[in-house]
């Protein structure tokens, strides 16, 4: 029995619903009473949802899963996962047993966009060329871990004296804090780019220092 799932991971935003597609080819005369369908976590074998003896056996996964009962007879064994959380990320196995059997695993990749970075400067007054300043770029509640890039006003990457920390909150979402230590020129713009590697989403923040005063676009 050929069980088919997408080769690429299913990407779902935190808080949205995701469909884990799974299909099989029913033989002529196939009856739902013969179908044994099990969705489980691939690694732990924890039961997620099942269908047996012609009946949906329900969700065993925080009551956030559902099948498409009207489509099962046509071989659609897809699973709907509601209100996706970071903890849902991983591999799910679709196991189908009729006369023959088959199984296949589909990966769920969870993502959350990062907020527009906020920029802070320390010290933030009486700045002169030659002073060393610390610029902090903060972006919140994204997933997975971000890639952070700094550049100056000419687009030249700034890689030295950068310290980036990422901390997960109780939902598993990351808050990113990246600190750039730089010696001020006569004037200049410093930009921080926070990239979500899954969504290919970039969040930009910048600070421009023009002697006095400073501006934060």
């Amino acid at each position: 029995l050929e069980v088919q799932v997408p080769e690429d991971p299913v990407v779902a935003l935190v808080g949205t619903d995701a469909t884990l597609c799974c299909s099989f080819s029913p033989e002529p005369g196939f009856s739902l009473a013969q179908l044994n369908l099990i969705w489980q976590l691939t690694d732990t074998k924890q039961l997620v949802h099942s269908f047996a003896e012609g009946q949906d056996q329900g969700s065993a996964y925080a009551n956030r899963t559902a099948l498409f009962p009207d489509l099962l007879a046509q071989g659609n064994a897809s699973l709907r996962l509601q209100r996706v959380r970071v903890a849902d990320e991983g591999s799910f196995t679709c196991f189908v047993s009729i006369r023959d059997f088959g199984s296949a695993a589909v990966s769920l990749q969870v993502a959350a966009p990062y907020s527009k970075p906020s920029m802070t400067l320390e010290p933030n007054k009486d700045l002169r060329p030659g002073d060393t300043v610390t610029i902090t770029c903060s972006s919140y509640r994204g997933y997975p871990e971000a890639e952070v890039f700094w550049q100056d006003g000419q687009g030249v990457p700034l890689t030295g004296n950068v310290t980036t920390s990422q901390m997960a909150n109780e939902q598993g979402l990351f808050d990113v804090h990246s600190v750039l230590r730089v010696v001020l020129g006569a004037n200049g713009t410093y930009s921080c780019l926070v990239r979500n590697p899954v969504l290919q989403q970039d969040a930009h923040g910048s600070v421009t220092i023009t002697g006095q005063p400073m501006t934060f676009p």
Epitope: L1, Q34, N36, S50, A52, E53, S97, R99, D100, F101
Partner: antibody, heavy 117, light 108 residues
């Protein structure tokens, strides 16, 4: 008539290998999953392994995982069990059985595997 | 893994009498349970599937009942050819496919 005929059993020493075969006839072999079930002398039945009709999916009992490999050749209507790193506790009659809807509707007569030093 | 426990281990019955064999599952298997008969020196043969459906050619003195976790195989009037070992097997949640330890039905 459905027929399953096992062969390849024998006496081997611990650590050695053996390959069992099961020749099937009387049905469309590729439409059914096939399984191996064993029975140690004087003991009950123990499921060993199963392979889907296409050969694309296989499962094993924990007791043989990593040592035994199930395979099939649908062009020859034959099921195989490659048994490596054999242990004394693998001594048993090995049956091949046709899987249908979850149960085993036809069984071979079995072949005896004895692992002894 | 679902564990199947069969009882009794041995059942002594006179020919013509009724035999009642039990199979209990460690968690629900719905009606996905099969029974097999095995005579000495022979492979097992399918008797009952889906808890209560007789396999092709099985006489009606054999009947299966139960659902969930408790199942019964009843042989209404034992014939001489019925003295054998009987095994139950679940196929609701697998792998692994699991068998009970067997019940031997012997002549009293």
């Amino acid at each position: 008539d459905v027929q399953l005929v096992e062969s390849g059993g024998g006496v081997v020493r611990p650590g050695e290998s053996l390959r069992l075969s099961c020749a099937a006839s009387g049905f469309t072999f590729s439409s059914y999953a096939e399984s191996w079930v064993r029975q140690a002398p004087g003991e009950g039945l123990e499921w060993v392994s199963i392979i889907s009709g296409s050969g694309g999916n296989t499962f094993y009992a924990d007791s043989v995982k990593g040592r035994f490999t199930i395979s099939r050749d649908n062009s020859k209507n034959t099921l195989y069990l490659q048994m490596n790193s054999l242990r004394a506790e693998d001594t048993a009659v090995y049956y091949c059985a046709r899987f249908a809807y979850g149960f085993f509707d036809y069984w071979g007569l079995g072949t005896l595997v004895t692992v002894s030093s | 893994e679902i564990v199947l426990t069969q009882s009794p281990g041995t059942l002594s019955v006179s020919p013509g009498e009724r035999a009642t064999l039990s199979c209990r599952a460690s968690q629900t298997v719905g009606s996905k349970l099969a029974w097999y008969q095995q005579k000495p020196g022979q492979p097992p043969s399918l008797l009952i599937y889906d808890a209560s459906t007789r396999a092709t050619g099985i006489p009606d003195r054999f009947s299966g009942s139960g659902s969930g976790t408790d199942f019964t195989l009843t042989i209404s009037s034992l014939q001489s050819e019925d003295f054998a070992v009987y095994y139950c097997q679940q196929y609701r949640n697998w792998p692994p496919l699991t068998f009970g330890g067997g019940t031997k039905v012997e002549i009293k």
